[in-house]
């Protein structure tokens, strides 16, 4: 999906008001310096592409974050403010949620959510030059 035409300001507002708090809750008990940020993004559409991938695509060691509150809210925000945000992606998320049996917060998941926090922070500061 091409995130170019999303309403970035409204997605940013949703992140600041609620998604960010859910990410912090998920990471509670973890030091902010514990993980290095290895995933970066260059502009807002690119940031949303990376956020979508990291939030909804299973990775080795972290089967799925799709059932977490921050993920459900991310999906809702993209569905509302990204025109034509693919129904297949929405449906794929539902299938993933059904497959997931039990909630296990692994170290790999914590690292992944730490990367997500970095991507969201970058999304909120689009005018900063890439390091």
């Amino acid at each position: 999906y091409d995130f170019t035409n999303c309403d970035f300001e409204k997605i940013k507002a949703a992140y600041l008001s609620t998604i960010s708090k859910d990410l912090i809750t998920y990471m509670s008990g973890t030091k902010s310096t514990e993980f290095n940020n290895t995933v970066s993004c260059s502009n807002r559409p690119h940031c949303l592409t990376e956020i979508q991938s990291l939030t909804f695509n299973p990775t080795a060691g972290c089967a799925s974050l799709a059932k977490e509150m921050f993920a459900m809210k991310t999906k809702a925000a993209l569905a509302i403010w990204c025109p034509g945000y693919s129904e297949t992606q929405i449906n794929a998320t539902q299938a993933m949620k059904k497959r997931r049996k039990r909630k296990v917060t692994t170290n790999k998941c914590l690292e992944q959510v730490s990367q997500l926090q970095g991507l969201w922070r970058r999304f909120n500061r689009p005018l900063l030059k890439q390091q």
Epitope: T18, A79, G84, I90, N91
Partner: antibody, heavy 121, light 111 residues
Framework: QEQLVQSGDEVKKPGASVKVSCKSS????????ISWVRQAPGQGLEWMGM????????NYAEKFQGRVTITADPSTTTTSMELSSLRSEDTAVYYC??????????????WGPGTPITVSS | QSAPIQPRSVSGSPGQSVTISCTGT?????????ISWYQQHPGKAPKLMIY???KRPSGVSDRFSGSKSGNTASLTISGLQAEDEADYYC???????????FGGGTQLTIV
Amino acid sequence: QEQLVQSGDEVKKPGASVKVSCKSSGFTFGSYAISWVRQAPGQGLEWMGMLVPLLGVTNYAEKFQGRVTITADPSTTTTSMELSSLRSEDTAVYYCARGGSNYLYWYFDLWGPGTPITVSS
Amino acid sequence: QSAPIQPRSVSGSPGQSVTISCTGTSSDIGGYNRISWYQQHPGKAPKLMIYDVSKRPSGVSDRFSGSKSGNTASLTISGLQAEDEADYYCSSYAGTDTFVLFGGGTQLTIV
């Protein structure tokens, strides 16, 4: 069963405000969006805006921006729509409608019975 | 953005088929597969008949079907029955500002 129950008929004077409520029952309130749609006498349907309880955000049609406010009380699973600066053209039946599940907010699979609002001096 | 265009009225005999068209633009109907159809009897709330172009909610008869070609969506009702007499509205997702646009409505008369 799943239903939306709306508040009763209203008669208002031009310039006044009106608030219509919509009580949800039989489904998980936070999993859906609630939209408001109006229908003037003998006319078609018009989407006004929606509230997404999961995010606590609203989205309004440009035509109604600044004049409509949609709020929710999750404790009573009630959504309210307030329309201000009423004029005679606002005379219509106002429906609350549930946006589809699984984030498919753009179709409406459950409707309230409608609340007639008459604006007359 | 203006409302998608529907014929004001269509008619058919019991057992026949009718098709109601809904013509929009590339910014709404042509741009997304987010088209719904609603049936409304006089004095009643609308009822969802078709969503996402051609999907039927549970409980809706398979006599109702939807399709889309370019900027035009269509609702076909086969084997017309007396209770099908009602107003029919198409609706389309129309981007993040307008969000949903309803067509002007079509009155179906069973003759």
